[in-house]
Amino acid sequence: CDLPQTHSLGNRRALILLAQMGRISHFSCLKDRYDFGFPQEVFDGNQFQKAQAISAFHEMIQQTFNLFSTKDSSAAWDETLLDKFYIELFQQLNDLEACVTQEVGVEEIALMNEDSILAVRKYFQRITLYLMGKKYSPCAWEVVRAEIMRSFSFSTNLQKGLRRKD
C-alpha cells in the first residue's frame, strides 16, 4: 500500500499544530521531564515489516487522538488549534485505515504485529498514567506535547523510508 503524499503532508501539519499549541516555555518544565520509553524498536528501519509499521502508526495516531480528546486536554489547549489537530489526525487515521485493510485484509495480525501494537499501547499507558499522576498540570501537558512531537517526527521520517522501499 502506498501511503499517499497527503498523509506525509498531514503528518507535517500535525507537527506544526503541536508546535503552535505550546503555551509554556519547555525550560520552565524541566523538573517534570520523564522518559516515556518510546518503542523505537517497533519502528526499527532495519527490521520492521511494512504491515507492522503501518499497524503501529495507526495505533499511535488513534491513541494520540484519544489522549487529546479528553476533557482535561480540552482545558489545556487552544480550542481552535486543537480542532485543527483533530482534523489532521482524523485524516491520517483514514489514510492508514485504508492501508491497514489493504496490507493484510482483515486477517488476524501476525505475532510480530501483535507485539508492536501492544508496545505502542503500553507507551501511551505510561503517558496517561504520568498525566494522571501530575494531575494534568500545565507542565505535564507540555512534557507530553513535546513527547508526542518527538514520536510524530520519528514516524514521519520512517514513512518517508516506507515510500522509498516501495
Epitope: 499497524s55 495507526h58 488513534q62 491513541q63 487522538f65 484519544n66 480528546s69 487515521l93 492508514l96 485505515e97 491497514v100 485493510t101 493484510v104 482483515v106 488476524e108 495480525i109 501483535e114 507485539d115 501492544l118 499501547r121 503500553k122 501511551f124 499507558q125 505510561r126 496517561t128 498514567l129 494522571m132
Partner: antibody, heavy 119, light 108 residues
Framework: QVQLVQSGAEVKKPGASVKVSCKAS????????MHWVRQAPGQGLEWMGE????????IYAQKFQGRVTMTRDTSTSTVYMELSSLRSEDTAVYYC????????????WGQGTLVTVSS | EIVLTQSPATLSLSPGERATLSCSAG???????LYWYQQKPGQAPRLLIY???NLASGIPARFSGSGSGTDFTLTISSLEPEDFAVYYC?????????FGQGTKLEIK
C-alpha cells in the same frame, strides 16, 4: 455515557455456530478496541480476543484461533463475535468490554449474553 | 501465556474485618498493566483498581492495591456487606491477556 448493549440469550446444538452482537454508544466507536471475554457457569473470566473497529483488524487468543471471528459494522457502531464448531464447554456468558487506557481499560462492559450449547 | 494464580480460592470473613487477596503471576507483569475487578452474581465485572494501586472512579478508599513483578495484593481495610463478591486480577502486559481464577469473598 458509554453503553454496550448485547444481543439476547442463545441456545445452540453442538457443531453449530453462534453470533453475538454488541452495540456501542456514547463515545467515538472507531477509536477504541473492543474485547470479548467469556465466563463458563461458576468459572472465571477468559479473554478471547479483540477487534479494532476502525480497520477491522483482530487479535485472537491462541485457544480460539480458527473458531472465532470478530467483525464490526461502523454504520451501526456494532461489533460481532462468531464462534463456530460449538461444544458443550462453550456454554458460557459472553461479554464485550471496551479497551482504553489507565482507568478506561475494561471500565465498560456489556450486560453479557448467555450461550447454551446442548443437544 | 502469563498464568495468574489467586489465593485463597475462598476467603470467609465478617464485616469490619480486613481482607487480603493475593495474585501471583507465572512471569513478571508490568505494574501498569495489572488490574483488579469485582463481580457479583448475575452482573458484569466492575473495575476496582487499575495499574496495581490506583482506585477506579467511584471506588471507596477502603480498597487498595500493591505489588510488583510477580506478586500483587488487593486489600480491603474494613469489609462492608456490599464487598462480598468474587475478585479477579487481570493482566494485559502480554498476549494473551489473562485473568486469575478468582477469589470468592464470603460472609463468615
Amino acid at each position: 455515557q458509554v453503553q454496550l448493549v448485547q444481543s439476547g440469550a442463545e441456545v445452540k446444538k453442538p457443531g453449530a455456530s453462534v453470533k453475538v452482537s454488541c452495540k456501542a454508544s456514547g463515545y467515538t466507536f472507531r477509536n477504541y478496541w473492543m474485547h470479548w471475554v467469556r465466563q463458563a457457569p461458576g468459572q472465571g473470566l477468559e479473554w478471547m480476543g479483540e477487534i479494532n473497529p476502525s480497520h477491522g483488524r483482530t487479535i485472537y487468543a491462541q485457544k480460539f484461533q480458527g473458531r472465532v471471528t470478530m467483525t464490526r459494522d461502523t454504520s451501526t457502531s456494532t461489533v460481532y463475535m462468531e464462534l463456530s464448531s460449538l461444544r458443550s464447554e462453550d456454554t458460557a456468558v459472553y461479554y464485550c468490554a471496551r479497551g482504553g487506557l489507565g482507568p478506561a481499560w475494561f471500565a465498560y462492559w456489556g450486560q453479557g449474553t448467555l450461550v447454551t450449547v446442548s443437544s | 501465556e502469563i498464568v495468574l494464580t489467586q489465593s485463597p480460592a475462598t476467603l470467609s470473613l465478617s464485616p469490619g474485618e480486613r481482607a487480603t487477596l493475593s495474585c501471583s503471576a507465572g512471569s513478571s507483569v508490568d505494574s501498569s498493566e495489572l488490574y483488579w475487578y469485582q463481580q457479583k452474581p448475575g452482573q458484569a465485572p466492575r473495575l476496582l483498581i487499575y495499574s496495581t494501586s490506583n482506585l477506579a472512579s467511584g471506588i471507596p478508599a477502603r480498597f487498595s492495591g500493591s505489588g510488583s513483578g510477580t506478586d500483587f495484593t488487593l486489600t480491603i481495610s474494613s469489609l462492608e456487606p456490599e464487598d462480598f463478591a468474587v475478585y479477579y486480577c487481570h493482566q494485559w502486559s502480554s498476549y494473551p491477556f489473562t485473568f486469575g481464577q478468582g477469589t470468592k469473598l464470603e460472609i463468615k
